[in-house]
Interface confidence: low
């Protein structure tokens, strides 16, 4: 009779983690008996995944009954694969012997490859916001997958960027890969309402990436401008003086008005009005009694923008002349006045 | 010998619905992931959908996702497409194709049945 | 999606010359290519896959070779039988996308 062969027909295995994978292994003979053990590797550091004769496998279960004297095929079956159980997996046939069986024979072996679906992309940003003009990185990481072809894209409000560089670790042979990849992005005063998008495509997402975003208002700081005027009121010897504020974000602001470098009033603006493009404006005014005044008085409108150093702008106060209309107030919003003598 | 038969391929007005069948024989059906290939007339080749060996995994051409849906009964050896909203340009030969390696993912297909023409049109 | 590039669209042939197909990937997609043949009125007919592995009871004079994102498809000695269609696939990113296809004819 022709000796015993064991047959691994499949030469590789391909299994989707969290599914099953099914090794499939006949023998072409019932002689001689004796005992199956399949294990992953070859060699003295072999590890044991299934022993007919004894032991407890609970991911294991055979696909026929193996305790029928005329059962053939040892095939097997691993429930809930994952990365780490990728590997070559033997089904090696034993001979029966005393005290100790001998191994007998051994299949060619099935690769088994474990597609694991990548982690969602997490994209960071810069720790400190930055102001336009200004190049920022972001990065994207994304972990676990396999096997280790992946595909990453960076958008920026639909628009494929192009200056990122990205890498997939480790280099050589692992039972599952991670993604990490660094964009550079040039920041525009538009950039409030802007996204920042990783986009991952791998084999087992069956063709609908995976997606991680930054919201550039996280990263952004845009500078307010300044300008100050002055009009009249009813009352002739009253000036109405503005310091309008615009285009700044985020909206954490703080004004400062001095007269003649002296510390009149300091408020933090609440009620702004918010532009299309995401930006912030917002209006402080004074109420200027000139009547009782002899000399030119100097105005200065400081402002301390998100605890960056402050900005300011001033305007001159001429007391001796009658106040000419000069610029217009356009904010219907106004914050509320401060009517102030000075003497 | 490893054969596959489609059937259930006709003419099919816009918006309507057909389902096609694959029946398997001369080998262990449940062993294989199966798919659906279409061919436009005097076109070239076009994956439309795939399924693992127990069906727990599906994937979709964008072109029929959500009109489409793969299916299959291990105990009947049959596969099946279900096809609703039907278009003009789903026009085609539908094959029905095998994976080479068993329990393994959509890659390779073969062998292929012979096709079914599915006509769509008013 | 991947794109597929097949060139050239058709080539004219006698018996016995070596033909070369090519398919470009657009991105890449290491050895998970196929290649098929077609002829008319029938079902594709896989002969290579794997880039290079050559399918069980295709004739030798049939080749593969390549890997990432340019493969070539080889007929060592055109056979009359081997006029037809062949089409290039890959299958490691869903969707799976065939080439265009290269047409082979008697010259």
């Known amino acids: 009779e022709e000796e015993l062969q064991v047959i691994q027909p499949d030469k590789s295995v391909l299994v989707a983690a969290g599914e099953t994978a099914t090794l499939r292994c006949t023998a072409t003979s019932l002689i001689p008996v004796g005992p199956i053990q399949w294990f992953r590797g070859a060699g003295p550091g072999r590890e044991l995944i299934y022993n007919q004769k004894e032991g407890h496998f609970p991911r294991v279960t055979t696909v026929s009954d193996l305790t029928k004297r005329n059962n053939m095929d040892f095939s097997i079956r691993i429930g809930n694969i994952t990365p780490a159980d990728a590997g070559t997996y033997y089904c090696v046939k034993f001979r029966k012997g005393s005290p100790d069986d001998v191994e007998f024979k051994s299949g060619a072996g099935t690769e088994l490859s474990v597609r694991a679906k990548p982690s969602a992309p997490v994209v960071s940003g810069p720790a400190a916001r930055a102001t336009p003009q200004h190049t920022v990185s972001f990065t994207c990481e994304s972990h676990g997958f396999s096997p280790r072809d992946i595909t990453l894209k960076w958008f920026k409000n639909g628009n494929e960027l192009s200056d990122f560089q990205t890498n997939v670790d480790p280099v050589g042979e692992s039972v599952s890969y991670s993604i990490h990849s660094t964009a550079k992005v040039v920041l525009t005063r538009e950039d409030v309402h802007s996204q920042v998008i990783c986009e991952v495509a791998h084999v087992t997402l069956q063709g609908d990436p995976l997606r991680g975003t930054a919201n550039l208002s996280e990263t952004i700081r845009v500078p307010p401008t300044l300008e100050v005027t002055q009009q009249p009121v009813r009352a002739e010897n009253q000036v109405n003086v503005t310091c309008q504020v615009r285009k700044f974000y985020p909206q954490r602001l703080q004004l400062t008005w001095l007269e003649n470098g002296n510390v009149s009033r300091t408020e933090t603006a609440s009620t702004v009005t918010e532009n299309k493009d995401g930006t912030y404006n917002w209006m402080s005014w004074l109420l200027v009694n000139v009547s009782a005044h002899r000399d030119d008085v100097k105005l200065t409108c400081q402002v301390e923008h998100d605890g960056q150093p402050a900005v300011s702008k001033s305007h001159d106060l001429k007391v001796s002349a009658h106040p000419k209309e000069q610029g217009s107030n356009t904010a219907a919003e106004n914050t509320g006045s401060n009517e102030r003598n000075i003497y | 010998q490893v054969q596959l038969v489609e059937s259930g391929g006709g003419v099919v007005q816009p918006g309507g619905s057909l389902r096609l069948s694959c029946a398997a024989s001369g080998f262990t059906f449940s062993y294989y992931g199966m798919s659906w290939v279409r061919q436009a007339p005097g076109k070239g080749l076009e994956w439309v959908a795939s399924?693992?060996?127990?069906?727990?995994?599906?994937y979709y051409a964008d072109s029929v996702k959500g009109r489409f849906t793969i299916s299959r009964d291990n105990s009947k050896n049959t596969l099946y497409l279900q096809m609703n909203s039907l278009r003009a340009e789903d026009t085609a030969v539908y094959y029905c194709?095998?994976?080479?390696?068993?329990?393994?993912?959509?890659?390779?297909?073969?062998?292929w049945g012979q096709g079914t023409l599915v006509t769509v049109s008013s | 999606d991947i794109q597929m590039t097949q060139s050239p669209s058709s080539v004219s042939a006698s018996v016995g010359d070596r033909v070369t197909i090519t398919c470009r990937a657009s991105?890449?997609?290491?050895?998970?290519l196929a290649w098929y043949q077609q002829k008319p009125g029938k079902a594709p007919k896989l002969l290579i896959y794997a880039a290079s592995s050559l399918q069980s009871g295709v004739p030798s004079r049939f080749s593969g070779s390549g890997s990432g994102t340019d493969f070539t498809l080889t007929i060592s000695s055109l056979q009359p039988e081997d006029f037809a269609t062949y089409y290039c696939q890959q299958a490691i990113y869903f969707p799976i996308t065939f080439g265009g296809g290269t047409k082979v004819e008697i010259k």
């Open positions: 399924i693992w060996v127990d069906g727990s995994s599906k």
């Open positions: 194709a095998r994976g080479v390696e068993t329990y393994s993912g959509p890659n390779w297909f073969d062998p």
């Open positions: 991105q890449g997609i290491s050895s998970w």
